[in-house]
């Protein structure tokens, strides 16, 4: 805390400029008017104030705006944003995407800090939903942003926003998140033709049900093994050998290398060994010839 002392004669700041970097902390406190600082916040970023001097400037703004800074000040905080605590940010009402971008720029190239997470949360809650422009901005700065949201939060993403999602944005999503995103993606891309549709939907297929995988198998999509390995096990199990062969196309040979891993392992256990042999890959572990397969889940559903 800086002591309250009178400003020395001739040192009263008329504007926020470079001369202030030579002021001691107590001089900044005494000689810089908080209202002047607020109206000239855009200049602070261009002036190499020390860490301690920035403490004084923040303190002045906090005194001027105890209920939280107005957006006109927030937009020009620049690197002073890095001094803010999540508690400070919770008092803000940020509505402009330009303000959000300006503050994210300061943290660019770094992990999402608690301050940034709070800022984004305030912004998205204020907007009511994750619209396309917001999602575009957030995933540009934080590719993993989408996968940091809960399935409940993802449910507020409108299908139109899915166009902003890049494959790498989904890298860390778990199946529960993809379950929410997949139907939105399906809706968003529904008017595209076969091959273009597959390119767009591919990253979301970890949330696809069996019937959609069966439909894709009829379209010569040549799904790669990496995508296949991310499919829901329960969606893959009912697929026939012929359907998997059509789905993977030339990539079907990759099944051999993955035969011990889910979902391939579990799928093999459900197939007739005769059918697996038709692939010519030496896959083992299928149901021996002559055995009868009872689908107990179907029987339970009927009773």
């Amino acid at each position: 805390e800086v002591e309250k002392t009178a400003c020395p004669s001739g040192k009263k700041a008329r504007e926020i400029d470079e001369s202030l970097i030579f002021y001691k902390k107590w001089e900044l406190e005494a000689c810089v008017d908080a209202a002047l600082l607020a109206t000239q916040m855009d200049r602070v970023n261009a002036i190499p104030f020390t860490y301690e001097q920035l403490d004084v400037l923040k303190h002045k703004l906090d005194e001027l705006y105890p209920q939280g800074y107005p957006e006109s000040v927030i937009q020009h905080l620049g690197y002073l944003f890095l001094k803010m605590s999540p508690e400070d940010i919770r008092k803000w009402n940020v509505t402009s995407l330009e303000t959000l971008k300006a503050l994210l720029e300061v943290n660019k190239g770094h992990e999402m800090s608690p301050q940034v997470a709070t800022l984004i949360d305030r912004f998205v809650k204020g907007r009511g939903q994750l619209d396309k422009d917001t999602l575009d901005t957030l995933t540009a700065f934080y590719p993993g942003y989408l996968c940091s949201l809960s399935p409940e939060e993802l449910s507020s993403v409108p299908p139109s926003s899915i166009w902003a999602v890049r494959p790498q944005d989904l890298d860390t999503c778990d199946p529960r998140q993809l379950d929410v995103l997949y139907p939105k993606a399906r809706l968003a891309f529904q008017n595209m033709n076969g091959s273009e549709y597959f390119v767009k939907i591919q990253s979301f297929l970890g949330g696809a049900p069996t019937e959609d995988l069966k439909a894709l198998s009829q379209q010569n999509v040549s799904m790669d093994l990496a995508t296949f390995m991310k499919l829901r096990t329960d969606a893959v199990l009912p697929l026939t050998v012929a359907e998997v062969q059509k789905l993977l196309g030339p990539h079907v040979e990759g099944l051999k290398a993955e035969e011990r891993h889910r979902p391939v392992r579990d799928w093999i256990l459900r197939q007739r060994q005769d059918d697996l042999d038709t692939l010519g890959l030496g896959l083992q572990g299928g149901i021996p010839n002559g055995y009868l397969v009872l689908d107990l889940s179907m029987q339970e559903a009927l009773s």
Epitope: Y51, L82, V106, N107
Partner: nanobody, 118 residues
Amino acid sequence: QVQLVESGGGLVQPGGSLRLSCAASGITFPVNAYGWYRQAPGKQRDLVAIISAGGTTNYADSVKGRFTISRDNSKNTLYLQMNSLRAEDTAVYYCYLQRRIGMLRDYWGQGTQVTVSS
């Protein structure tokens, strides 16, 4: 980690010159500004000169026209050329740099003693 090592200090007569150097290493981020501070015995540390990433320089009134700050990016070295030295320039001189992207952090060297005396 970031290391700033000053050199070039020493004893000099009034009116003489010295050139301080500061070798920086371990910098893996964009630097916002480099500077020189000094601290005389029993006094607070004061900013002497600063140079921004864009090359803009600023000087304390007491050294304007006598001191020149510069840097050599290829050698990762900061300099302070001090001419027309006075007794009141006697102090420990510290090299300093600012990080302002991703985190706010100021880095300081250990200091080099400059004594101006006849």
